[in-house]
């Protein structure tokens, strides 16, 4: 599932590049392992912002699929309460390219621990 998430992120990156969307998104670029689920939540919430702002059906479908995949992959620990983690709004705002790169990095963290 996580491998499919990465391929979806690559697809979103390609779609966004062709549309020239200029947005800044809350980005966790240095995820602590004890905050990875919280960070994943922030990434997914921001992805929905991309979907809504783009108004593009392909991006919408891909983001929706990515959320479905992430939910299923996290079904065992998605409701774990992590303490001492940053709120999404406390994160640094970065451009879409940097956001997606950081997203891939956190997904790889999940792959490495699964």
């Amino acid at each position: 599932n996580w491998v499919n998430v990465i391929s979806d992120l690559k697809k979103i990156e390609d779609l966004i590049q062709s549309m020239h969307i200029d947005a800044t998104l809350y980005t966790e670029s240095d995820v602590h392992p004890s905050c990875k689920v919280t960070a994943m939540k922030c990434f997914l919430l921001e992805l929905q912002v991309i979907s809504l702002e783009s108004g593009d059906a392909s991006i919408h479908d891909t983001v929706e699929n990515l959320i479905i995949l992430a939910n299923n992959s996290l079904s065992s620990n998605g409701n774990v309460t992590e303490s001492g983690c940053k709120e999404c709004e406390e994160l640094e705002e970065k451009n879409i390219k940097e956001f997606l790169q950081s997203f891939v990095h956190i997904v790889q963290m999940f792959i490495n621990t699964s």
Partner: antibody, heavy 122, light 112 residues
Framework: EVRLMASGGGLVQPGGSLRLSCAAS????????MSWVRQAPGKGLEWVAT????????YYPDSVKGRFTISRDNSKNTLYLQMNSLRAEDTAVYYC???????????????WGQGTLVTVSS | DVVMTQSPLSLPVTLGQPASISCRSS???????????LEWYQQRPGQSPRLLIY???NRFSGVPDRFSGSGSGTDFTLKISRVEAEDVGVYYC?????????FGQGTKLEIK
């Protein structure tokens, strides 16, 4: 008023195939994910398949995975369910349903068709 | 798979009286973004199912306000404040947080 008309049901032998159709009208079909849900005679509801708005993503339970294929033709406002290797336990009324977006709405099936009966028997 | 368990399976109610249906999931159905994709559907005799409630407590358009949904995590409830004759049918809870999406067994509401 949103309209969904399922068709294509009938009697088929075990191991056989059938293709169901669902004609959609009175809404922009390509803006919605769609699902199939079935109901065996006298039984409860069972989710069968879901397809994304553009048709790139499909989801199934293990009970039909590899045997059923959901697809859509947005130019014809039509949803399909190709059913292969049919079994007696696939006998049911099959409903098509429109799905609200997870991102903009509630990810619910807000409108349902009237259903078409599939009977698998020798 | 997430198992949805409803109770009671049969619910005889006097007209004008309240009714309550419980639905319990085998695990939390809160998704990663904090949403809970729990719906309630009504199926009147001989008819197709109809959406009543989505995301636990949101009433779908055209649904009378005597229907209400509540709950969180793994425990959910559908309440009808005053049962009317047209409410007869089977009520299903449904989770679509995790694939495969799953329905409860259904609760048959009938008039005493």
């Amino acid at each position: 008023e949103v309209r969904l008309m399922a068709s294509g049901g009938g009697l088929v032998q075990p191991g056989g195939s059938l293709r169901l159709s669902c004609a959609a009208s009175e809404f922009t079909f390509s803006n919605y994910a769609m699902s199939w849900v079935r109901q065996a005679p006298g039984k409860g509801l069972e989710w069968v398949a879901t397809i994304s708005r553009g048709g790139d993503y499909t989801y199934y339970p293990d009970s039909v995975k590899g045997r059923f294929t959901i697809s859509r033709d947005n130019s014809k406002n039509t949803l399909y369910l190709q059913m292969n290797s049919l079994r007696a336990e696939d006998t049911a009324v099959y409903y098509c349903a429109r799905r609200v977006s997870m991102i903009t709405g509630g990810w619910a099936m807000d409108y349902w068709g009237q259903g078409t009966l599939v009977t698998v028997s020798s | 798979d997430v198992v949805m368990t409803q109770s009671p399976l049969s619910l005889p109610v006097t007209l004008g009286q309240p009714a309550s249906i419980s639905c319990r999931s085998s695990q939390s159905i809160v998704d990663i973004t904090g949403n809970t994709y729990l719906e309630w559907y009504q199926q009147r005799p001989g008819q197709s199912p109809r959406l009543l409630i989505y995301k636990v407590f949101n009433r779908f358009s055209g649904v009378p306000d005597r229907f209400s949904g509540s709950g969180s995590g793994t425990d959910f409830t559908l309440k009808i404040s005053r049962v009317e004759a047209e409410d007869v049918g089977v009520y299903y809870c449904f989770q679509d947080t995790f694939v495969p999406y799953t329905f409860g067994q259904g609760t048959k509401l009938e008039i005493k």
